[in-house]
């Protein structure tokens, strides 16, 4: 059976798909499509996977989803929200993606790979 | 949109205490490093302090170290600036604003006035 990718690895290859979603966007993402805010109780990964898997029929965030799905220990399901913090604050998902591409990046540089 | 909607300036004697606060909306607050900058009447911008993601690393200006105190609550998305032993070179307009090195990412907020005077 195939090794498993390093994290490291796995995390380099998810900054560069944000990369091309954030380069690439022409009509607005996921036709505007709004996400809930998070918190970090979850953890960055889990806590980005609670509010992007409630995004449907937007195939420009499907192989994200799938990529953050690989980090998250635990299974996520739509309208899961441990890691949300104020039901009300909702923002694009595209803004959503730009700030957990910023995010990723800083982690990247730091190391911390889980 | 991203919004940052500074409070709590105002006028204040030398030697007194105010805090500053700076509410954040339309992005993911714990996710950036914050800060604090300053312009003065008829100055330039100056940058007064920042803080990590986290809340665990804080840097600060000479100018108000020992002074200033820096704290971010992520559940509450804001931002502070606890200001003691206030001067009047303290005297400025203070904007909260994100602190991140990669270009695209500048959020500023509209400033809030602080006046130090007797």
């Known amino acids: 059976s195939p090794s498993p990718v390093p994290r490291s690895t796995a995390l380099k290859e998810l900054i560069e798909e944000l990369v091309n979603i954030t380069q690439n966007q022409k009509a607005p993402l996921c036709n505007g499509s709004m996400v809930w805010s998070i918190n970090l109780t979850a953890g960055v990964y889990c806590a980005a996977l609670e509010s992007l898997i409630n995004v449907s029929g937007c195939s420009a965030i499907e192989k994200t989803q799938r990529m953050l799905n690989g980090f998250c220990p635990h299974k996520v399901s739509a309208g899961q929200f441990s890691s949300l913090r104020v039901r009300d604050t909702k923002i694009e998902v595209a803004q959503f993606v730009k700030d957990l591409l910023v995010h990723l990046k800083k982690l990247f540089r730091e190391g911390r790979f889980n | 949109g991203v919004q940052l909607l500074e409070s709590g300036g105002g006028l204040v004697q030398p030697g007194g205490s105010l805090r500053l606060s700076c509410a954040a909306s339309g992005f993911v607050f714990p996710w950036y490093d914050m800060g604090w900058v300053r312009q003065a009447p008829g100055k330039g911008l100056e940058w007064v302090s920042s803080i990590d993601w986290k809340g665990g690393k804080t840097y600060y200006a000479d100018s108000v170290k020992g002074r200033f105190t820096i704290s971010r609550d992520n559940s509450k998305n804001t931002l502070y600036l606890q200001m003691n032993s206030l001067r009047a070179e303290d005297t400025a307009v203070y904007y909260c604003?994100?602190?991140?090195?990669?270009?695209?990412?500048?959020?500023w907020g509209q400033g809030t006035l602080v006046t130090v005077s007797s």
């Open positions: 604003a994100t602190a991140e090195d990669e270009p695209g990412y500048d959020y």
